[in-house]
Amino acid sequence: QRLPRMQEDSPLGGGSSGEDDPLGEEDLPSEEDSPREEDPPGEEDLPGEEDLPGEEDLPEVKPKSEEEGSLKLEDLPTVEAPGDPQEPQNNAHRDKEGDDQSHWRYGGDPPWPRVSPACAGRFQSPVDIRPQLAAFCPALRPLELLGFQLPPLPELRLRNNGHSVQLTLPPGLEMALGPGREYRALQLHLHWGAAGRPGSEHTVEGHRFPAEIHVVHLSTAFARVDEALGRPGGLAVLAAFLEEGPEENSAYEQLLSRLEEIAEEGSETQVPGLDISALLPSDFSRYFQYEGSLTTPPCAQGVIWTVFNQTVMLSAKQLHTLSDTLWGPGDSRLQLNFRATQPLNGRVIEASFPAGVDSSPRAAEPVQLNSCLAAGD
């Protein structure tokens, strides 16, 4: 098992912006915005100016019962956040069709803003979460999930798309971030590292976790993804960190046991329906939230990110299976498929719980550095 206690870290929430034109041109970075050291090569995601978004009202759902025993982020040690040593690289790319700029990859040419100008936006994902700087927002109620326990039939498509492993979800999985903030789940996918190298996209005080699950949702205000891209709140992603624990995770095993069948890029298989909520942490009440973007091109903004405080435990063998089974284009392994963390550029990450309160004896009074923007009130 990993680290025992992770101290609160970075901001989520309030002020990230969406694009009015989903995949339209954004202002590209100005000269003084130079690439950050921890960016993988070819991914100079420099800020461009944009209008700040208004927040959309969305829906409410039913809290999930709490289970004990999973590691919590606030139980992990504080770690320094130097430039990330493990550069995301792409092992999922082939320049088979010449200079096609839609052939993006991790950690190499072409630079992502050339693939999609939105990737140079000011409010990108992933980010480093620093709980001490998060704004406690009591208005952030427990997430509500409905219909996530799927019957075995119909089966679901599990595909190696060259960038990740993706499970396409059927209609009927409903999620609410709060009253009037309702969404439908579309798909889930994972990000991971390589042997001895963690591969989560978000970090907590610079700590990168072994892997991360993303469940992507479409707002019920939109019928299709193409209508929602770049609209504030049009898409919402539930994200959870995957950690090493002593036992096999039976929910994840239903997917991991099938990865060999889709080892080759582009291959797919059908898997029986399963309880999707079992792939997420049990505590739906403690999370960080901020507005960011898709973490792969086209990098459209306006995406509401909800990052669980509680982590999910997989066995060492399962994490190895995840990072060591799939292949990308050519003869390269599909590994280290994460984007470098992006600057907050003034965004404040919100927390549904007092993550920034220092309970150590040093502080006479609990200190919360940022105040809640009361989104959703």
Partner: nanobody, 117 residues
Framework: QVQLQESGGGLVQPGGSLRLSCAAS???????????MAWYRQAPGKQRELVAV???????KYSDSVKGRFTISRDSAKNTVLLQMNSLKPEDTAVYYC????????WGQGTQVTVSS
């Protein structure tokens, strides 16, 4: 609203060739540059099956039944995906559907391919 439109189907003799095309249209047609594109087919009374897929990185995958006879390609600039079908057999008779997988599935209406003498 984005739409996928297949064309190129028809009646062909065994051993013959056809070239199916799938064109994307609509305001946000750009997103198909970032979609895995695939051809599926459905024969009468059978389940829809994957024929071929091309990922955003240009990687291709074929079902065993068409390997070596069919070729999938994409022209991202023109938002089209092609399926070149050679050495056609009667068992290739089906409705062929174009699919784009970008966060959700987009489907065309299908085009009929009939292989018969």
């Amino acid at each position: 609203q984005v739409q996928l439109q297949e064309s190129g189907g028809g009646l062909v003799q065994p051993g013959g060739s056809l070239r199916l095309s799938c064109a994307a249209s609509g305001n946000s047609v750009n997103i198909f540059r970032f979609a895995a594109m695939a051809w599926y087919r459905q024969a009468p009374g059978k389940q829809r099956e994957l024929v071929a897929v091309i990922t955003t990185t240009g990687g291709t995958k074929y079902s065993d039944s068409v390997k070596g006879r069919f070729t999938i390609s994409r022209d991202s600039a023109k938002n089209t995906v092609l399926l070149q079908m050679n050495s056609l057999k009667p068992e290739d008779t089906a409705v062929y559907y174009c699919n784009a997988d970008y966060l959700q599935d987009y489907w065309g209406q299908g085009t009929q391919v009939t292989v018969s003498s």
